[in-house]
């Protein structure tokens, strides 16, 4: 913490301007009034403060607003945002997308993924849902940030907004997030024709259940291997060799390359070797001929 001293009369601060860059840390602490700083935050980012000086300014604001900064201050934080921790940001209530844009721009090129994720979370809470304007802002200023949101926050996305999400926005989404987004996408795109539908739904398919994958296999979609590899293991395992062949079309040859990787490896282990041989790819590890397959999962569910 900065030690407190009294401010020399000649150093008294009446406005936030460039003269402050010549103040030592303790002079800033003693001479800058927190309320004045808050009122003139829009000037701070234009002044080349050192990181040490920014620490002092942050300390001032923290003392003035122990419950969290008001949005009028947050909007003008500029490079002071780089000093904020996720714990600081968690106290904020942010509703303006202009505020979000400004801070996303500042964070570019800095290792601030935790702070940005928390900021986006606060925006979603502040606005009540992840509406189209918010999604548009995220996709424009922070590709991939959508996936920083928790499944609980993503559940507030209306299906009508899903069309604004681009494939690259979902690259870093995990299964739990896709579980939330996929059904919304299926609802949002359900009026499209087969081929158009597949193009739209493809980035979300990591959240699809088995029955949807089976249904896709009946539609000549020729799924690429990258999409197939992102399918849930549990969605792939029940598929027959014929269904996978129809699903992948000409891309079926790629199974050989992915033979040792999940979910292909796990799927191979569940197929009869005879059936795998029909693909002509030399896939090995299937159930040998003459072996009986008992599906204990259904039996357990019945007992």
């Amino acid at each position: 913490d900065v030690e407190r001293t009294t401010c020399p009369p000649e150093k008294e601060v009446h406005e936030i301007d460039e003269s402050l860059i010549f103040y030592k840390k303790r002079e800033l602490e003693a001479c800058v009034d927190a309320a004045l700083l808050a009122a003139q935050m829009d000037r701070v980012d234009a002044i080349p403060f050192t990181y040490e000086q920014l620490d002092v300014l942050k300390h001032k604001l923290d003392e003035l607003y122990p419950q969290g900064y008001p949005e009028s201050v947050i909007r003008h934080l500029g490079h002071l945002f780089l000093k904020m921790s996720p714990e600081d940001i968690r106290k904020w209530n942010v509703t303006s997308l202009e505020t979000l844009k400004a801070l996303l721009k500042v964070s570019k090129g800095h290792e601030m993924s935790a702070q940005v994720a928390t900021l986006i979370d606060r925006v979603v809470v502040g606005r009540g849902q992840l509406d189209k304007d918010t999604v548009d802002t995220l996709t424009a200023f922070c590709p991939g940030c959508l996936c920083s949101l928790s499944p609980e926050r993503l559940s507030s996305v209306p299906p009508s907004v899903i069309g604004a999400v681009r494939p690259q926005d979902l690259d870093t989404c995990g299964p739990r997030q896709l579980d939330v987004l996929y059904p919304k996408a299926r609802l949002a795109f359900q009026n499209m024709s087969g081929s158009e539908y597949f193009v739209k739904i493809r980035p979300f398919l990591g959240g699809a259940p088995t029955e949807d994958v089976k249904a896709l296999s009946q539609q000549n979609v020729s799924m690429d291997l990258a999409t197939f590899m992102k399918l849930r293991r549990e969605a792939v395992l029940p598929l027959t060799v014929a269904e996978v062949q129809k699903l992948l079309g000409p891309h079926v040859e790629g199974l050989k390359v992915e033979e040792q990787h999940s979910p292909v490896r796990d799927w191979i282990l569940k197929q009869r070797q005879d059936d795998l041989d029909t693909l002509g790819l030399g896939l090995q590890g299937g159930i040998p001929n003459g072996y009986l397959i008992l599906d204990l999962s259904v039996r357990e569910a019945l007992s």
């Epitope: 499944p151 009026n191 259940p209 088995t210 949807d212 009946q218």
Partner: antibody, heavy 122, light 107 residues
């Protein structure tokens, strides 16, 4: 073939929590989305919400604050908890399978349990 | 939410005759509409989805039509087992919503 069976108390006191379980037999719970739908005596149907085997849910906004839908894949079961019940929650509660396959693109129900009547009364 | 309104509330028709049931949506649901039949003490049974596609095992006398906000379920020649309550359901958006039902009774 796949069958659904609801189970739980038939009588719940006002302000308490209604708890029901649906057991899926003859197939894996992992393949579909599963819903709860209710029907007050002599009235129409109301969708409560759905769950995916991973635990991802979506509920009717009119009930959302009181509803918890959960899943137990090891038992092939999913459950409904409805808190702070009143007499207006007296209904036959059905569990149902949402088809929604891409081939037919939609969220409707092709398989239903027989339903269980839950009465809210002191 | 999308409100589904069915008419009439009760329809009296003689066996062998044609029955026409209506369902109206408060906003467009495209063709994302299903019809169910429910008999006393039983769960609903899916008849039609996609506004006009018959579900597996449903007799050809059941047909659906319409899109947008106006839909019709037609039963061409009523059999004794067809007397029941019929519900429409939209799945164009969440929450999924049902009509209040049309009771089809013997005249």
């Amino acid at each position: 073939q796949v069958q659904l069976q609801e189970s739980g108390p038939g009588l719940v006191k006002p302000s308490e929590t209604l708890s029901l379980t649906c057991t899926v037999s003859g197939g894996s719970i992992q393949n579909y989305y599963w819903s709860w739908v209710r029907q007050p005596p002599g009235k129409g149907l109301e969708w409560i919400g759905y769950i995916f085997y991973s635990g991802s849910t979506n509920a009717n906004p009119s009930l959302k604050s009181r509803v918890i839908i959960s899943v137990d894949t090891s038992k092939n079961q999913f459950s409904l908890k409805l808190s702070s019940v009143t007499a207006a929650d007296t209904a036959v509660y059905y569990c149902a399978r949402e088809v929604g396959r891409i081939a037919v693109a939609g969220w409707f129900f092709d398989l239903w349990g027989r339903g269980t009547l839950v009465t809210v009364s002191s | 939410e999308i409100v589904m309104t069915q008419s009439p509330a009760t329809l009296s028709v003689s066996p062998g005759e044609r029955a026409t049931l209506s369902c109206r949506a408060s906003q467009s649901v495209n063709s994302n509409l299903a019809w169910y039949q429910q008999k006393p003490g039983q769960a609903p049974r899916l008849l039609i989805y996609g506004a006009s596609t018959r579900a597996t095992g449903i007799p050809a006398r059941f047909s659906g039509s319409g899109s947008g906000t106006e839909f019709t379920l037609t039963i061409s020649s009523l059999q004794s087992e067809d007397f029941a309550v019929y519900y429409c359901q939209q799945y164009n958006n969440w929450p999924l919503t049902f009509g209040q039902g049309t009771r089809l009774e013997i005249k």
